[in-house]
Interface confidence: low
């Protein structure tokens, strides 16, 4: 139909710059390139109705719905959202197309729904329908990858059942220990699901999507390496696949590998072997033990034996539910102002935990390091000698764990004073918590040595500032001290600090700080 205008509907995603929430018909913002929403005529609709592709928006994201109208003459418009009419101000671009925009700032649930745009041109009237919904990230998942043997091939497939579909990559390293860290030059990454080169020292598979990145290491026993002092341990949940690789290198091919579970040979179909010659003509053999879906009775000691190497074992423990084992009793530490110190938590967990360290409602990234004995450790050193409560929180799919730490910094008290018509108060945050004395300064005692004991009320640790205790002392005013200077002193094992206060003086109270080491 020649009378119908040429319409283009686009979505513009904005980089949020913390603008306030609101709707507007034209709004300049930093933006990404527009995405065509392909406005199509809606069939069998009364009147001319165009329908844009559905728009999914992240919570708090900012977007612009925009319509470009290639029609002669002026246009007028009206937006309707949830039965409310919204102002509409069309303008024209350089190609003389009518441009109508709806800006949604910081997307919320209330801003989701159908946006109708009614446009009236000199030739015709038409309606454009946009459906905007919040992207349901609750449905997003990122699952740890697992391995499967490729049908009829000596290769492993890496699978991560995640939403949105993750990017899967193999992370390979042929060095030992530290040099196999993620960004090391010894590490090779292959962005593919299938891996044929299974002879490497360290093989991991990682999956990543909008929720982050999860990795699984191929559990390996290397018969040419000295065994750990404690037996390596592998935890799995019922139903998960078990994969253990046994690797051995020998001067020639005259050796074989076997797997046993609890002194009993593994059944046919639960293992497969591969071998290759290395560059120096030595023979490398690997033997995989695998169970596609473990049950509790797959728990036990898996031993890899060779006719030319000492055998080595691993303990496989199948659990019904994930766990986090650690002592959750709170711990208190007292350190000097410049003493080096780190909090640490030692734990055993399966599946791997996600963790945070929190101080004063601020979260800090949490690093974990595996120890040789099957335990892991997380340390936090970035306390910047700030006293207070520090919280370690860890969780995995099945368990949660929280541990509290208190850090006290040994230091001399610092005194702050305030006064009212009826009393004077002093506050101090030193540690150990200080004791208080009040002294009266008078003609008889110009050095303020006359001690005040009446009307003094001490409160230890009466309020917490960012988890830091504050001690206070209050002196109730009496006729005997009105108009006099008084001195409050806080002292602990590291020193003394005082403030002098003029009681009942007109106007603001003058405070004189007086530090005594």
């Amino acid at each position: 139909n020649q009378d119908l205008p040429v319409i283009k509907c686009v979505l513009i995603n904005h980089k949020n710059n913390d603008s306030s929430v609101g709707k507007s018909s034209s709004y300049p913002m930093v933006s990404e390139s527009p995405e065509d929403l392909g406005c199509a005529l809606r069939p069998q609709s009364s009147g001319t109705v165009y329908e844009a592709a559905a728009v999914e928006v992240d919570v708090s994201a900012s977007i612009t719905l925009q319509v470009l109208v290639d029609a002669p003459g002026n246009i007028s418009c009206l937006w309707v959202f949830k039965h409310s009419s919204l102002n509409c101000q069309p303008h024209f671009d350089l190609q003389n197309r009518g441009v109508v925009s709806m800006v949604i700032l910081k997307m919320t649930e209330t801003q989701a729904g159908e946006y109708l745009l009614f446009i009236q041109s000199e030739a015709t009237n038409y309606t454009i329908l946009f459906t905007v919904s919040i992207r349901n990230t609750l449905l997003y998942t990122l699952r740890r990858p697992y391995f499967r043997k490729m049908e009829n091939q000596d290769a492993l497939v890496c699978i991560s059942e995640s939403v949105p579909e993750p990017i899967v990559e193999w992370v390979l390293c042929d060095s030992q220990g530290e040099s196999c860290k993620e960004e090391s030059p010894a590490v090779v990454k292959k962005e593919e699901k299938v891996l044929h080169e299974l002879f490497g020292t360290d093989i991991r598979c990682c999956a990543r999507n909008e929720l982050g990145r999860e990795c699984t290491r191929l559990f390996t026993i290397d018969l040419n390496q000295t065994p750990q002092t404690t037996l390596p341990q592998l935890f799995l949940k019922v139903g998960e696949p078990l994969w253990i690789r046994c690797k051995a290198v020998h001067v020639n091919h005259g050796f074989g590998l076997t797997w046993e579970l609890e002194n009993k040979a593994l059944e046919e179909g639960n293992y497969f072997e591969m071998s290759t010659y290395s560059t120096n003509r030595t023979m490398i053999r690997i033997l995989f033990a695998f169970v596609s879906s473990v049950a509790r009775n797959d728990t036990g000691y898996y031993t890899c034996s060779s006719s030319k190497h000492p055998s080595q074992s691993a303990l496989v423990t199948i659990v019904e539910k994930g766990f986090i084992n650690a002592t959750n009793s709170s711990e208190d530490y007292e350190i000097d102002q410049y003493e080096e110190f780190c909090f640490s938590v030692r734990f055993k967990a399966y599946p791997q935990i996600r963790c945070t360290w929190t101080f004063s409602r601020k979260s800090f990234p949490c690093e974990q390091k595996g120890l040789d004995n099957g335990y892991s450790i997380s340390k936090f050193c970035n306390h910047k000698h700030q006293p207070g409560e520090y919280i370690f929180h860890a969780e995995n799919d099945d368990a949660q764990f929280t541990k509290m730490f208190t850090l006290n910094i040994r230091r001399k008290p610092q005194v702050l004073a305030e006064a009212s018509a009826s009393q004077a108060s002093c506050f101090s945050d030193g540690y150990p918590l200080p004791s208080w004395t009040w002294k009266k300064c008078s003609d008889k005692s110009p050095n303020c040595t006359e001690e005040i004991t009446e009307g003094v009320w001490n409160r230890k640790a009466n309020r917490k500032v960012f988890g830091q205790w504050v001690s206070s002392s209050t002196l109730n005013m009496s006729e005997a001290i009105k108009g006099f200077l008084v001195k409050c002193c806080a002292y602990n094992s590291l020193g003394t600090s005082c403030e002098t206060i003029l009681l009942n003086s007109p106007g603001p109270f003058p405070f004189i700080q007086d530090n005594i080491s």
Epitope: N263, R296, Y301, G374
Partner: antibody
């Protein structure tokens, strides 16, 4: 929850046989090994043997070989331990116990006291 | 057969004490060692398996360490319910063998 319920106490004469039963519930019977361990009065624990309830295969401690027989009935989730040619030193509490793998023992029956006395 | 020797055979301690029980194997058993607690008239209860792994539901004051021939069970802060007899057991080879037990009593 996992439960291992054993048959009641027995008094036997020397030379006789005793058959102790152990009924398992609360888990998949064929998925776990079953051990038999005994404890003489005031003494320590002594391992007698193990049965795989799935296949029925057994391993016995050398000391009891020829005198002990371990069997299972998968239809009733029950294992049996029969000890023959009883002597007075066989007086003990006999425990059936579920194996975590073949190695550690994570659940135990309540025990059956077998007294051998003339 | 592998012999397991526990020491001490009996031990007196108070609530709150840190207690250590040792177990020695007559040959190397890697980490194939388990610890059990037994109270009078009751069946034993698994505390630690594979030398250092805490059995589910067991309080974290119990810990195990060691490998090869020397092993230790530690109770970090003794509670009233911990007074019992403790056994180590090797699962390196059959027959499985137990230590003779360590009786822990209230001082």
């Amino acid at each position: 929850q996992v439960q291992l319920v054993q048959s009641g106490a027995e008094v036997k004469k020397p030379g006789a046989s005793v058959k102790v039963s152990c009924k398992a519930s609360g888990y998949t019977f064929t998925s776990y090994y079953m051990h038999w361990v005994r404890q003489a009065p005031g003494q320590g624990l002594e391992w007698m043997g193990i049965i795989n309830p799935s296949s029925g295969s057994t391993t016995y401690a050398l000391k009891f070989q020829g005198r002990v027989t371990m069997t299972r009935d998968t239809s009733t989730s029950t294992v049996y331990m029969e000890l023959s040619s009883l002597r007075s030193e066989d007086t003990a509490v006999y425990y059936c116990a579920r194996g975590l793998g073949k190695s550690a023992i994570d659940y135990w029956g309540q025990g059956t006291l077998v007294t051998v006395s003339s | 057969d592998i012999q397991m020797t526990q020491s001490p055979s009996s031990l007196s301690a108070s609530v709150g004490d840190r207690v250590t029980i040792t177990c020695r194997a007559s040959q190397s058993i890697s980490s194939y060692l388990n610890w059990y607690q037994q109270k009078p008239g009751k069946a034993p209860k698994l505390l630690i398996y594979a030398a250092s792994s805490l059995q589910s539901g067991v309080p974290s004051r119990f810990s195990g360490s060691g490998s090869g021939t020397d092993f230790t069970l530690t109770i970090s802060s003794l509670q009233p319910e911990d007074f019992a007899t403790y056994y180590c057991q090797q699962s390196y080879s059959t027959p499985l063998t137990f230590g003779q037990g360590t009786r822990l009593e209230i001082k």
